[in-house]
């Protein structure tokens, strides 16, 4: 897919501020209100933000902007600058009435959709496990095993750095076709097949991609939280996989929730398949020494680790990725295709 | 610690109403879902009923729709059940319960539970 | 709404003894499934959640298993205080459902 440029975004901050600039009065207040980042720091949810009054006039004069509301995507060229101002302008949005973060990302529709031949497979054995033959239809193409190879490079090796090794993971699954992404980590395994489910968990190289020693989890989002792309992604997740109703059915399409979850890959707060046995995902992180905020810590983890709405768009992939090596389709290139064109 | 304390339990006659409250103390009460479970003298126990942490959704057993109501109020971190038209197979200790923290996406975990209220529905 | 048959409906054993309850689901709900205990008067206490977590402060002789229709809670040397009642409930599809419970008796 090419990235999506600027003008393909119904209100680009990138644009939005370009437009701010312009205008004298938003331009001396976004920067007012971007110098008042040192003295607000961002509150997590358990606390309440002290504003001093020069900053809430700032953000009361952008609120009539159309910085308001703006979006990014996240494929798009200059996705940082473009969240930084989001972080910003959401100052404004939330300063004296601290409200629920909202996701900066706006939903655009793939063009095309996404084919690739199964029959090139033939040179697996028949009863190669599936975690296998996803991983060959990622070598089988330029862009994801070159991508593949970049993030396998980077985390391998007994002194492997794992700043480099996050960020190249966040490459691979943000530029390789979310096919193959998806079809990487979200690789069905037999129960019995412990082999096939190790795969599966070392798929995100965890010996380097994860903390060594289990952080707290509030320390870890709080990490998360200073920095504009990581924060994003982790209100994205909470946005888009947060159950709505009695049965745990996602707020939005299954679908946008596990872009959501992959997008997590390769920030602070990456999470993983915690066993080679069963699909429970979780962050690496503990809620011991979390004192008074042991609630909130536990609401955090929970979010991953005991999300019906998460849990049932993981089974639903991964009962969709099982059925496109069965004999039912009519043309190997036809699966994809449907699916792709459903989402 | 968290703790939930029902009230309200009462004799009543078939036909009558009665309120039962659910007080809760100990954790953030919005962000859960609470849930009425009963048991009649010697049996086993059945769900009542359920409402989500907002108060917008509410779901109910068949044996008690269109009697009764469940509903809360996140000021005073308390859950109600309203009862009306009661019958003689009313008659239960109720209970009110949640998710713990870990478990708060998961509406219908049960996880921390009230000391119960009793209701005896006869004439 | 979904039946869980609960096994035995009632048991006898010694202090020491271990014991197994199972819990049967008319349909699949994954691994949706909690046990509690109930003492005689009291209000239930969760003891394992998920299928097989054991709830904080709950004594490791308690232990759960199974995924899909067939469960189980095994208790490891029985001590006195565990000759309660077990119920077991999935909250996989709704209506939430108990199995009928079964009583834990000494011999």
């Known amino acids: 897919d090419p990235l999506p440029t600027e003008s393909r975004l119904m209100n680009s901050c990138l644009q939005a501020r370009r437009k701010c600039q312009a205008d004298p009065t938003c331009s001396a207040a976004y920067h007012h209100l971007d110098s008042c980042t040192s003295s607000i720091s961002t509150p997590l949810p358990s606390e309440e933000p002290s504003v001093p009054a020069d900053c809430l006039e700032a953000a009361q004069q952008l609120r009539n902007s159309s910085l308001i509301g703006c979006m990014c995507h996240r494929r798009m060229k200059n996705q940082v600058a473009c969240l930084d101002i989001y972080w910003t302008v959401h100052r404004a949005r939330s300063l004296g009435n601290y409200e629920l973060d909202v996701s900066p990302y706006e939903d655009t529709v793939t063009s095309k959709p996404w084919k690739m031949n199964l029959s090139k497979l033939n040179m697996l054995k028949p009863d190669s496990d599936l975690c296998l033959k996803f991983a060959m239809l990622c070598t089988l193409n330029d862009k994801c095993d070159r991508l593949r190879k970049a993030y396998g490079e980077a985390c391998s090796g007994p002194h492997c750095q794992r700043h480099v090794c996050l960020r190249q993971l966040l490459t691979f699954f943000e530029k390789a076709a979310e096919p193959h992404a998806q079809g990487l980590l979200l690789c069905p395994c037999a129960p019995n097949d412990r082999g096939c489910g190790e795969r599966r968990r070392n798929t995100i190289a965890p010996n380097c991609a994860l903390p060594p020693v289990a952080p707290n989890c509030l320390e870890l989002r709080r990490l998360c939280f200073s920095d504009p792309l990581c924060r994003s992604r982790l209100v994205d997740f909470q946005t888009h996989c947060h159950p709505m109703d009695i049965l745990g059915t996602c707020a939005t399409e299954q679908s946008r929730c596990l872009r959501a979850y992959l997008g997590l890959i390769g920030t602070a707060m990456t999470p993983n398949f915690v066993s080679n046995v069963n699909t429970s995902v979780a962050l690496s992180c503990t809620c011991r020494g979390s004192g008074n905020l042991q609630e909130e810590c536990e609401m955090l983890e929970g979010f991953f680790s005991h999300n019906p709405c998460l849990t049932e768009a993981i089974a639903a992939k991964m009962r969709f990725h099982s059925q496109l090596f069965s004999q039912d389709w009519p043309h190997p290139t036809f699966a994809v295709m449907a699916h792709q064109n459903e989402n | 610690e968290v703790q939930l304390l029902e009230s309200g339990g009462n004799l009543v006659q078939p036909g009558g109403s009665l309120r039962l409250s659910c007080a809760a103390s100990?954790?953030?009460?919005?962000?859960?879902?609470m849930t009425w479970v009963r048991q009649a003298p010697g049996k086993g126990l059945e769900w009542v009923s359920t409402?989500?942490?907002?108060?917008?959704?509410?779901y109910y057993a068949d044996s008690v729709k269109g009697r009764f109501t469940i509903s809360r109020d996140n000021s005073r971190d308390t859950v109600f059940l309203q009862m009306n038209s009661l019958r003689a197979e009313d008659t239960a200790v109720y209970y009110c319960?949640?998710?713990?923290?870990?478990?708060?996406?998961?509406?219908?975990?049960?996880?921390?539970w009230g000391q119960g209220t009793l209701v005896t529905v006869s004439s | 709404d979904i039946q869980m048959t609960q096994s035995p409906s009632s048991l006898s054993a010694f202090v020491g003894d271990r014991v197994t309850i199972t819990c049967r689901a008319s349909?699949?709900?994954?691994?949706?499934l909690d046990w509690f205990q109930q003492k005689p008067g009291k209000a239930p206490k969760s003891l394992i959640y998920?299928?097989?977590n054991l709830q904080s402060g709950v004594p490791s002789r308690f232990g759960g298993s199974g995924s899909g229709t067939d469960f189980t809670l095994t208790i490891n040397s029985l001590q006195p205080e565990d000759f309660v009642t077990y119920y077991c409930?999935?909250?996989?599809?709704?209506?939430?459902?108990f199995g009928g419970g079964t009583k834990v008796e000494i011999k």
């Open positions: 319960s949640k998710p713990s923290a870990l478990r708060f996406l998961h509406w219908l975990a049960m996880d921390v």
């Open positions: 100990g954790f953030t009460f919005s962000s859960y879902a």
């Open positions: 409402i989500s942490g907002s108060g917008t959704s509410t």
């Open positions: 349909q699949d709900i994954r691994n949706y």
């Open positions: 998920a299928a097989s």
């Open positions: 409930q999935q909250y996989n599809s709704y209506p939430p459902t």
